[in-house]
Interface confidence: low
């Protein structure tokens, strides 16, 4: 038994042309976790049991918003370690997914949602009680870098974690035949049960007379390898007993099986395993069907009750994208006429129209200058479909019953900077704040609403949470 | 699969208060978002309260203050302490679970709450 940790420590735009946009907004924070999946690397059942050997889920990182004309950075990653127990021994050979989540941190009413950002996947050597190894593996223009080791839990040790350490019978030594137990030199190792010449490295046992060996080697006493033919190729020096001891590049060099596949060298090439959904000889098509629960956001699936039948993802108010993973920007329709400033709530729009201009898009135009008064010496202005009051020096507003300075009175809270505007004021809020007078925070501690259910939906129906 | 089963609906009056609970089997609660919705008779379903895998609750504008949502990993269960109660309040409470294992929702059954005089 022992632990799977895994350490992320950049997450960011990779290098070259073509940086990615920031994953958050100004209008819309948000934060990453991260998801691990493991499965023993040349496990044939692993494309139906994807994560056979474990599974984390990382916190939420912290909150980000993207400073307007700045480079993408880094983004802020979760504290801690992702760690996976595992009971049994440790494989020495594995197969990793992470994927890396995005939380979108909505207004008061529009909640959180989730979308996966990138997905990297890659086939390990790994001993147990070694050294942390580092890795940096790239999704379209993201760079993940992260290390990873395989610890024991005692009284195991070794490689695999399958040697057991007892306490010491005799204060000074271990008995005869026995080694101390590195790095617990005041322990000693169990007597050893295994058939006599089991590999100490490959082999192992869980009962007295056996020797079950590790992923990637076989035989008796499990010494040799459970493939030596690319060492007979000029990739590298081969021996009947020890495999392969200097690999060349190889066919699964680079993993290129897509979307989390785990690759296996064939004679003449390489094959790949692709996980649930996904299929394809490098698992590039998607066999995703409904029964998969492809559409996020609430998003309702038709069709696809087959993997060669597709299916379609209808899309509740707000999301778009073949499975409903993006936020519709609907003011990017600029919806609001004659002026009127646009908010997306999440769950419906509004428009905030210019004095003069009403109705749910500003189209209905106010009453013009007949019977309307302007306070303080100000007079009524026709122009442009829009009637407004000029007013007289040190007055402003709709009526010129403000005082000329509206941002006098410090109306933005939580430290949102203050802007006179035409109509009145704007508030630009400071990251993690939002709201026209900047007065909600986007998360404290579990203030902000949830968006609610499409409507139609029975119990049942596919639909998806955040 | 996971098994949804709520309990603790009833008729209470208004400013009363109940509390539901959401038993689930089959993965630990500590591995699910789980949210409560509730749909009212010839209204659309919307979602009160949500608790994610990290503890982080989040709730409708309109029940912020009055309900509460908790876990106890211990029985698997996950509950609804809704207190000061409105005749609003009146409605089918649903139990909902976002599974990350699997990426699947489900849904429970419904327990039913009205708030009358």
């Known amino acids: 038994a022992g632990v799977f940790e895994l350490q992320i420590h950049s997450f960011g735009p990779g290098p070259g042309p073509g940086a990615p946009r920031s994953p958050c907004s100004a209008r819309l924070p948000c934060r990453l976790f991260f998801r691990v999946c493991l499965k023993p690397g040349l496990s044939e059942e692993a494309a139906e049991s994807p994560c056979a050997l474990g599974a984390a889920l990382s916190a939420r990182g912290p909150v980000y918003t993207e400073q307007p004309g700045a480079p993408a950075p880094d983004l802020p990653l979760p504290d801690g370690l992702l760690q996976v127990p595992f009971r049994d021994a440790w494989p020495g050979t594995f197969s990793f997914i992470i994927e890396t989540w995005r939380e979108e941190l909505g207004d008061q009413i529009g909640g959180p949602a989730w979308s996966l950002l990138a997905r990297v996947a890659g086939r390990r050597r790994l001993a147990a009680g070694g050294p942390w190894a580092r890795d940096i593996q790239r999704a379209g223009a993201w760079e993940l870098r992260f290390s990873y080791r395989a610890r024991c839990e005692p009284p195991a040790v070794g490689t695999a974690c399958t040697r057991l350490c007892r306490p010491r019978s005799a204060p000074s030594r271990c008995g005869p035949g026995l080694r101390p137990c590195a790095p617990l030199e005041d322990e000693c190792e169990a007597p050893l049960v295994c058939r006599a010449g089991c590999s100490p490295e490959h082999g192992f046992c869980e009962q007295p007379g056996e020797c079950r060996c590790l992923e990637g080697w076989t035989g008796p006493l499990c010494t040799v390898p459970v493939s030596t033919s690319s060492c007979l190729s000029p990739r590298g020096p081969s021996s009947a007993t020890t495999g392969c001891l200097v690999p060349g590049p190889g066919p699964c060099d680079g993993n290129p099986c897509a979307n989390g596949g785990s690759c296996s060298e064939t004679p003449r090439s390489f094959e790949c395993t692709c996980p649930r959904g996904f299929y394809g000889l490098r698992c590039e098509v998607s066999g995703v069907t409904c029964a998969d629960g492809p559409c996020f956001n609430g998003g309702l699936c038709v069709g696809g009750a087959d993997p060669d039948s597709a299916y379609i993802c209808h899309c509740p108010p707000g999301f778009q994208g073949s499975n409903c993973e993006k936020r519709v920007d609907r003011c990017s329709l600029q919806p609001c006429r004659n002026g009127g400033l646009c908010l997306d709530l999440g769950h419906a729009l509004r428009c905030r129209c210019r004095a003069g201009f009403a109705g749910p898009r500003c189209e209905h135009d106010l009453d013009d200058c007949a019977g309307r008064a302007c306070a303080n010496g100000g007079t009524c202005v026709e122009g442009g479909g829009a009637h407004r009051c000029s007013c007289a020096l040190g007055f402003g507003g709709r009526d010129c019953r403000e005082r000329a300075d509206p941002c006098a009175a410090r109306p933005c809270a939580h430290g949102g900077r203050c802007y006179a505007h035409f109509s009145g004021l704007v508030c630009a809020c400071a990251p993690g704040y939002m709201g026209a007078r900047c007065e909600f925070p986007v998360h404290p501690d579990g203030a902000s609403a949830l968006p609610a259910a499409p409507p139609g939906l029975r119990p049942g129906d596919p639909q998806r949470y955040l | 699969e996971v098994q949804l089963v709520e309990s603790g609906g009833g008729l209470v009056q208004p400013g009363g208060s109940l509390t539901l609970s959401c038993a689930a089997s089959?993965?630990?609660?500590?591995?699910?978002?789980i949210a409560w919705y509730r749909q009212a008779p010839g209204k659309k379903r919307e979602l009160v309260a949500g608790i994610s895998t990290d503890g982080s609750t989040d709730y409708l504008h309109s029940v912020k203050g009055r309900f509460t949502i908790s876990r106890d990993n211990a029985k698997n269960s996950v509950y609804l302490q809704m207190n000061s109660l409105r005749a609003e309040d009146t409605a089918v409470y649903y139990c909902?679970?976002?599974?990350?294992?699997?990426?699947?929702?489900?849904w429970g059954q419904g327990t039913l709450v009205t708030v009358t005089s």
């Open positions: 909902y679970a976002y599974t990350w294992t699997t990426r699947l929702p489900y």
């Open positions: 089959a993965s630990s609660v500590t591995l699910l978002s």
